[in-house]
């Protein structure tokens, strides 16, 4: 166990299990849709560069109520450095642009898709 | 904010299921976490639960020995330990961020904190 910040953590999960369990969890979630993801709730589109999982966290924060989407934000958490809050926004989102969940989850699923055969885990 | 029972001293091998409940607001609406804390040692986290339930994770340390489970009704969190060690002994504690979903464990000591506790409750687990 690693000391950090005062509690005792897990270690490590290596980033490529990490990832490699975060576009399961995205390609789990657009196989099994049946009606509108999150009832077909809005988000703010982000830009997929660096710093785009905390962006994406940001964006998916504000959906409540969406039990389909728990498993993303908790995976996404651990890849962001930071706590985020509900509000926040990063200079990563495309302000006046707002899409479906579903659609935010498949844009982000394919992006990581090709992060993953480039080989590009953190 | 909360309030943990349930603790108490058991034999090695022997179960104990531990309750949290939160007098002042609704449990069902938010991730609830168990942590634990034996002497001299740092807080460690034991698990946690999503608002709807469909997510819950467990440290290797309790995998296939303790299980989460959550009573909306009941506005009440379950930490059902079985198969209980002596490096089980600690005291026992939920905490909440009024979030729906867990906290990465990885997470955890690196900006990802539970802002809300209870007191705790002990566990012993001796013969």
């Known amino acids: 166990l690693t000391c950090l910040g005062g509690f005792a953590s897990p270690g490590p999960v290596p980033p490529s299990t990490a990832l490699r369990e975060l576009i399961e969890e995205l390609v789990n979630i657009t196989q099994n849709q049946k009606a509108p993801l999150c009832n077909g709730s809005m988000v703010w589109s982000i830009n997929l560069t660096a710093g785009m999982y905390c962006a994406a966290l940001e964006s998916l924060i504000n959906v409540s109520g969406c039990s389909a989407i728990e498993k993303t934000q908790r995976m996404l958490s651990g890849f962001c450095p930071h706590k985020v809050s509900a509000g926040q926004f990063s200079s990563l989102h495309v302000r006046d642009t707002k899409i479906e969940v579903a659609q935010f989850v498949k844009d982000l699923l394919l992006h990581l898709k090709k992060l993953f055969r480039e080989g590009q885990f953190n | 904010q909360l309030v943990e029972s349930g603790g108490g001293l058991v034999q090695p091998g022997g179960s104990l299921r531990l309750s949290c409940a939160a007098p002042?607001?609704?449990?069902?609406?938010?991730?609830i976490a168990w942590f634990r804390q034996s002497p001299g040692k740092e807080r460690e986290w034991v698990s946690c639960i999503s608002r709807s339930g469909g997510d819950t994770i467990y440290s290797d340390s309790v995998k296939g020995r303790f299980t989460i489970s959550r009573d909306n009704a009941k506005n009440t969190l379950y930490l059902q330990m079985n198969s209980l060690r002596a490096e089980d002994t600690a005291v026992y504690y939920c905490?909440?961020?009024?979030?729906?979903?867990?906290?990465?464990?990885?997470?955890?000591?690196?900006?990802?904190?539970?802002?809300?506790w209870g007191q705790g409750t002990q566990v012993t687990v001796s013969s």
């Open positions: 905490a909440t961020d009024k979030r729906s979903f867990c906290y990465a464990p990885e997470g955890l000591g690196k900006g990802w904190t539970y802002d809300y």
């Open positions: 002042r607001f609704t449990l069902g609406s938010y991730a």
